[in-house]
């Protein structure tokens, strides 16, 4: 999906009002310095692409983020403010994947959510020059 035509300000408002709080709740008990940010993004569409990937694509050691509150609210926001997002088709590879339904918080998931927080912060400051 191409995030170029999204209403970025509305998505930012949704992040600030709800999604950010859910991310903080997920990370509660974790020191903010515990993980290094290794994922970056260069502009708002790119940030949303990376956010979607980290939120919904299962990774080694963390297959369970998609059912978290912040993930569901992210999807709900994108569906409203990204034209055509809700019409996205599932490809054959996605359809064949067996997904775990159990919510398990692993250290790898905490690291992934820490990366997500960094991506969202970057999304909210689009005029900053890339470090």
């Amino acid at each position: 999906y191409d995030f170029t035509n999204c209403d970025f300000e509305k998505i930012k408002a949704a992040y600030l009002s709800t999604i950010s709080k859910d991310l903080i709740t997920y990370m509660s008990g974790t020191k903010s310095t515990e993980f290094n940010n290794t994922v970056s993004c260069s502009n708002r569409p790119h940030c949303l692409t990376e956010i979607q990937s980290l939120t919904f694509n299962p990774t080694a050691g963390c297959a369970s983020l998609a059912k978290e509150m912040f993930a569901m609210k992210t999807k709900a926001a994108l569906a409203i403010w990204c034209p055509g997002y809700s019409e996205t088709q599932i490809n054959a590879t996605q359809a064949m994947k067996k997904r775990r339904k159990r919510k398990v918080t692993t250290n790898k998931c905490l690291e992934q959510v820490s990366q997500l927080q960094g991506l969202w912060r970057r999304f909210n400051r689009p005029l900053l020059k890339q470090q």
Epitope: Y1, T55, F56, M72, K73, K75, S86, I90
Partner: nanobody, 117 residues
């Protein structure tokens, strides 16, 4: 199998109200993102309102007039539409998305809302 059945559409005068219902089967609402979308004649389908985990989001064009809600015990989502305008005339679709696929939604068959005097 996910099934969504909308009801509650019809003809209403400008300024009037309608409540759309979306009866869901094959899944439980609290595990899903639920949404209402609409398609006016000759236009693209657009998002109206979504709800997930208690969070609700609205398109600018309906904010303050429409309210989305979900009753988990009845496995039904609702769209309360107040202060309706002629430009709200459209086919309204209920949609649901299981958590695992980023942008994929399952769709109901739609219900027509006509706002006219």
């Amino acid at each position: 199998e996910v099934q969504l059945v909308e009801s509650g559409g019809g003809l209403v005068q400008p300024g009037g109200s309608l409540r759309l219902s979306c009866a869901a089967s094959g899944f439980t609402l609290d595990d899903y993102v639920m949404g209402w979308f609409r398609q006016a004649p000759g236009k693209e389908r657009e998002g109206v309102a979504t709800i997930a985990g208690g969070g609700t989001y609205y398109a600018d064009s309906v904010k303050g007039r429409f309210t989305i809600s979900a009753d988990n015990s009845k496995n039904t989502a609702y769209l309360q539409m107040n202060s309706l305008k002629p430009e709200d005339t459209a086919v309204y679709y209920c949609a649901s998305s299981g958590s695992y696929y980023p942008g994929h939604f399952e769709w109901g068959q739609g219900t027509l809302v006509t706002v006219s005097s």
